[in-house]
Interface confidence: low
């Protein structure tokens, strides 16, 4: 929801967290602001304190329950309001009818590990974190491998168009240090976006045996 030069963007992690960023040009840095969440069909509401992340933007996380609890569904509407203190009263700065399953951003994949490594290939697995059972298998992944002398931005993206929590990296160079990252996205949701990248997993390919190429 945008009010003039104000921008209010929120994402649901599919379980029990709504993360919001509010930016407003010329907003006072020392103003106390909150995000209020009022679901239309739940007997709870939630508030979080907006904290500055840059000169003109603030962020906070609405913690709706324990990390793996399913707090919202595809037919929920959550009215989200940015409220800022003006003296003794609160002023509404932004409002949106938030549809959680249209605005998804999952948690970054976790538990990355090397299952098997050879000279030219490496099999890596991971797990998704706090993802709703509603998705069943309707998830996709992107992965990237950092090679020596390159940046993450230069790394080509590998797309897995199904819920596949492993990858076999091929055509690697023997005895070389690599890093690997993966991210996840549900297929559902008009404004759904990719999760953050996972923590990088560092691994090293095996050296080539003398006189052999395995």
């Amino acid at each position: 929801a945008v009010n003039g030069t104000s921008r209010f963007t929120c994402f649901y992690n599919s379980r029990a967290n709504i993360s919001c960023v509010w930016s407003q040009d010329g907003a006072l840095q020392d103003t106390s602001c909150q995000v209020h969440a009022w679901p239309d069909r739940r007997r709870w509401n939630q508030t979080c304190e907006l904290l500055p992340v840059s000169q003109a933007s603030w962020a906070c996380n609405l913690i709706l329950g324990t990390p793996d609890s399913q707090k919202l569904t595809a037919v929920d509407i959550v009215t989200l309001r940015v409220m800022c203190r003006e003296g003794v009263r609160w002023r509404m700065m932004a409002i949106q009818d938030f549809k959680p399953f249209e605005n998804l951003r999952l948690m970054a994949p976790i538990s990355l590990q090397v299952v098997h490594v050879e000279t030219h290939r490496c099999n890596i697995s991971w797990k998704i974190s706090q993802a709703s059972h509603y998705f069943e298998r309707h998830l996709e992944f992107e992965a990237r491998t950092l090679s020596p002398g390159h940046t993450w931005e230069e790394a080509p993206l590998m797309t897995l168009k199904q819920k596949q929590e492993w990858i076999c990296l091929e055509t690697l160079t023997p005895d070389t240090q690599y890093e690997f990252q993966v991210r996840v996205k549900p297929l559902q949701g008009e404004f759904t976006t990719w999760s953050p990248w996972s923590q990088p997993l560092a691994f090293r390919t095996k050296p080539a045996a003398l006189g052999k190429d395995t």
Partner: antibody, heavy 119, light 106 residues
Framework: EVQLLESGGGLVQPGGSLRLSCAAS????????VHWIRQAPGKGLEWLGV???????DYNAAFISRLTISKDNSKNTVYFQMNSLRAEDTAVYYC?????????????WGQGTLVTVSS | DIQMTQSPSSLSASVGDRVTITCQAS?????MYWYQQRPGKAPRLLIY???NLASGVPSRFSGSGSGTSYTFTISSLQPEDIATYYC?????????FGQGTKVEIK
């Protein structure tokens, strides 16, 4: 006391348009969603759509091409517009509001307004 | 869309009788609602969230069920209960109602 009052019903020509009003009192339409439901003579109830407190809408897909729900917060009134009317759109049209939460169902209903589509 | 099938479509019972209406959903739903509609009137909410009695509703009305199968019961039918009763799901859009059960007194 929560009250909903529909108006704007009557006789409409086939192919014409319909604009109904739902005046709310006892609550603010900036705090609650307002739904529209209709009932053809001698038939059951059919949910048409809703406008939420912040102004976004959800429509029954069967009506999405010819239905618009809007509101005027300053008048605390919700509007229902349907185009390309046909005889089978003849019905009593209700606006309704859930309780404090949708878990509480359609706790509040207007009295309904009859729309007759006929030449 | 989720189809809601009520049975019976009509029934006739004596004052004091126990009356049961069932509602079958075409796929699993989480929340079921029951309404009473007297002739020429708007519907009135009786049961919300499957089994909770709406404000001011007599305790002879009750609801139960889960998944795809739900039941509405009037424990002791009264003359003022003559009406049509509707079930409604609120788990998936579009919201859908059963076709109604007309209750009459013998």
């Amino acid at each position: 006391e929560v009250q909903l009052l529909e108006s704007g019903g009557g006789l409409v020509q086939p192919g014409g348009s319909l604009r109904l009003s739902c005046a709310a009192s006892g609550f603010s339409v900036t705090s609650y969603g307002v739904h529209w439901i209709r009932q053809a003579p001698g038939k059951g109830l059919e949910w048409l759509g809703v406008i939420w407190s912040g102004g976004s809408t959800d429509y029954n897909a069967a009506f999405i091409s010819r239905l618009t729900i809007s509101k005027d917060n300053s008048k605390n009134t919700v509007y229902f517009q349907m185009n390309s009317l046909r005889a089978e759109d003849t019905a009593v049209y209700y606006c309704a509001r859930a309780g404090d939460y949708n878990y509480d169902g359609f706790a509040y209903w207007g009295q309904g307004t009859l729309v007759t589509v006929s030449s | 869309d989720i189809q809601m099938t009520q049975s019976p479509s009509s029934l006739s019972a004596s004052v004091g009788d126990r009356v049961t209406i069932t509602c079958q959903a075409s796929s699993s739903v989480s929340f079921m609602y029951w309404y009473q509609q007297r002739p020429g009137k708007a519907p009135r909410l009786l049961i919300y969230d499957t089994s909770n009695l709406a404000s001011g509703v007599p305790s002879r009305f009750s609801g139960s069920g889960s998944g795809t199968s739900y039941t509405f019961t009037i424990s002791s039918l009264q003359p003022e209960d003559i009406a049509t009763y509707y079930c409604q799901q609120w788990s998936t859009y579009p919201l859908t109602f059963g076709q109604g059960t007309k209750v009459e007194i013998k």
